[in-house]
């Protein structure tokens, strides 16, 4: 499978602003916690108590005094609990404590990487055993098809052109016509309405060789709330030992309940030197692996999750730190999955996203 | 085996605040959501707060938005309920609950251990 | 949020099969089943996202979602599962809610 060599940095990935970003605008990104514009009445008209007042509701918790990044200035409609009902205010109604504000989403949201609009179900286990994940909590996730509509691996949207997925997907064939990507699925199949179907245009593989590569989409992806990148980490990080991340796809689930469904599962990451310990994996993994899962079993990534994430929660926003790549069965005991170590890839994913 | 312990609960004067507490004990805390639950005298459960295992995510129940914040800390193990401007309908017993999951989504489907509770009593 | 709905009261004889249902939660929702000995005793978590069950629940007890209903299924009722039922449902952008309770008595 011809190389096309060379790598990348995503164009700024059409990200949008963070919805924690304050706004002036009279308009609001996602559930409106960066909304600071002027909207002063309640969905029924109502006006809204000023938030320093204590008059006709007492309150202490969101003041201006205990909340100050909150934009709690005069009766301003304000999100600083982060409801997912979106900006609310106490009432000037006496018998109505708080109520929401009609504020509207802005125009053309903007949606930062690893940044989910829906939050993740957080399961502790694994993929084999894990659980079905909240439908589109994971919107970078990328079902990998052949042109006839088979998933057969998962990949991660990293830009809008561009999806990461693991080298031997891409065995069978080295003809881009020969993929497709399904992007915003939860369904395996009987994909919903809002799915984006997109052909691939080019393939790259890594140069030397190793479990990772790169698919160009034919048109670019719409960025929208179920269809986010992932943010790529810095390059040759190196996730702590025990980091709890999560992986997810529609592999193979082994009986487990969930099959055709997204399933997600969160898993520690285990250092190389004790992954490679002899009653482990026994020095099969190399420095641009990485291994994760409990030694228990019970919990692990299998086929058909192959070029999928594993990300790992940092700050505010999920990192993509591995590609699902091998194991040694699905799910045994003393035997981690093991993930290509995406920090290792950063200068040549950038690169070739840069050059193509 | 998972344990869940309130306090902070008894006779509480209207227009004050209450501050409540979960010790947690028997299973990995960081890793879960965590709840709280409460029910009024003869009557049904009612979702109060609830809070994501690394404490980025809060969700208030309606009855109690504006009044009210929830808190943990990971290194204590324990979770706060903070309900501000006390009113006789707050009377009732407080349920800390564990979720089966790690995000604070969903507290009345997801929760699968509760607490014994604590009894709060707002009067005058 | 709407209401809940779920019968206020349902009987059966020990060992046969009671179902109780939940609906109003909305397609896109979760449900969980608690069941609660007496007022005032801590609720025990029979089933949470629509179908699992803890590891000390006894297998009779099991739950089902079809559409925007949930059901909580007792096969082989015993005498101590008499009791009130809560059923609870929300969905990732809603806080969430419960049910009123149903009581089952065993005769």
């Known amino acids: 499978s011809g190389t096309e060599a060379s790598v990348v940095a995503p164009p700024p990935v059409v990200l949008l602003p963070d919805v924690e970003t304050p706004s002036e605008e009279d308009c609001m990104f996602g559930n409106g916690k960066g909304y600071r514009g002027k909207r002063a009445t309640t969905v029924t008209g109502t006006p809204c108590q000023d938030w320093a007042a204590q008059e006709p509701h007492r309150h202490s918790i969101f003041t201006p005094e205990t909340n100050p990044r909150a934009g709690l200035e005069k009766n301003y409609c304000r999100n600083p609990d982060g409801d997912v009902g979106g900006p609310w205010c106490y009432t000037t109604n006496p018998r109505k404590l708080y109520d929401y504000c009609d504020v509207p989403q802005c125009a053309a949201p903007s949606f930062d990487c690893g940044k989910p609009q829906v939050e993740p179900k957080k399961c502790p286990g694994r993929v084999v055993g894990g659980c079905v994940a909240h439908p589109h909590s994971w919107p970078w996730q990328v079902s990998l098809r052949t042109r006839f509509g088979m998933h057969f691996c998962g990949g991660t949207l990293i830009s809008p052109e561009w999806v990461l997925t693991a080298a031997h997907c891409l065995e069978k064939s080295p003809r881009p016509s020969s993929y497709k990507v399904i992007l915003g699925a939860h369904q395996e199949v009987n994909l919903e309405p809002h799915v984006q179907e997109i052909e691939v245009s080019r393939l790259f593989l890594e140069p030397t060789r190793k479990d990772i590569a790169l698919l160009k989409l034919s048109s670019p992806a719409v960025i929208t709330d179920k269809v986010i990148p992932a943010c790529l980490p810095s390059p040759n990080y190196v996730v702590a030992d025990r980091t709890e991340c999560f992986i997810t796809g529609w592999g193979e689930t082994q009986g487990t309940f969930g099959a055709g469904l997204l399933k997600e599962a969160q898993l520690p990451v285990i250092e190389n030197k004790v992954c490679n310990r002899y009653e482990f994996l026994n020095g099969r993994v190399q420095s641009t692996e990485l291994c994760a899962g409990h030694l228990a079993g019970g919990t692990d990534s299998c086929q058909g999750d192959s070029g999928g994430p594993l990300v790992c929660f940092e700050k505010d926003k999920y990192i993509l730190q591995g590609v699902t790549s091998w194991g040694l069965g699905c799910a045994r005991p003393n035997k981690p999955g093991v993930y290509v170590r995406v920090s290792r890839f950063v200068t040549w994913i950038e690169g070739v996203m840069r050059n193509n | 085996a998972v344990t869940l312990d309130e306090s902070g609960g008894g006779l509480q004067t209207p227009g004050r605040a209450l501050s409540l507490v979960c010790k947690a004990s028997g299973f990995t805390f960081s890793s879960y959501a965590m709840h709280w639950v409460r029910q009024a005298p003869g009557k049904g459960l009612e979702f109060v707060a609830g809070?994501?295992?690394?404490?980025?995510?809060?969700r208030y129940g309606a009855a109690v938005k504006g009044r009210v914040t929830i808190s943990r800390d990971n290194g204590q193990s324990i979770v706060r309920l903070q309900l501000d401007n006390l009113r006789a309908e707050d009377t009732g017993t407080y349920y800390c609950?564990?979720?089966?999951?790690?995000?604070?989504?969903?507290?009345?489907?997801?929760?699968?251990?509760w607490g014994h509770g604590t009894e709060v009593i707002v009067s005058s | 949020q709407a209401a809940l709905t779920q019968p206020s009261s349902v009987s059966a004889n020990p060992g046969e099969t009671v179902e109780i249902t939940c609906s109003g939660g909305g397609r896109s929702s979760y449900y969980g089943w608690y069941q609660q000995k007496s007022p005032g005793s801590a609720p025990v978590t029979l089933i949470y996202d629509n179908t699992n069950r803890p590891s000390n629940i006894p297998s009779r007890f099991s739950g089902s979602k079809s559409g925007s209903t949930a059901t909580l299924t007792i096969t082989g009722v015993q005498g101590e599962d008499e009791a009130v039922y809560f059923c609870?449902?929300?969905?990732?952008?809603?806080?969430?809610?419960f049910g009123a309770g149903t009581t089952l008595t065993v005769l």
């Open positions: 809070i994501d295992n690394i404490g980025s995510y809060t």
């Open positions: 609870g449902s929300a969905d990732s952008s809603t806080t969430g809610i």
């Open positions: 609950a564990k979720s089966a999951y790690g995000g604070s989504c969903c507290g009345p489907a997801y929760i699968d251990a």
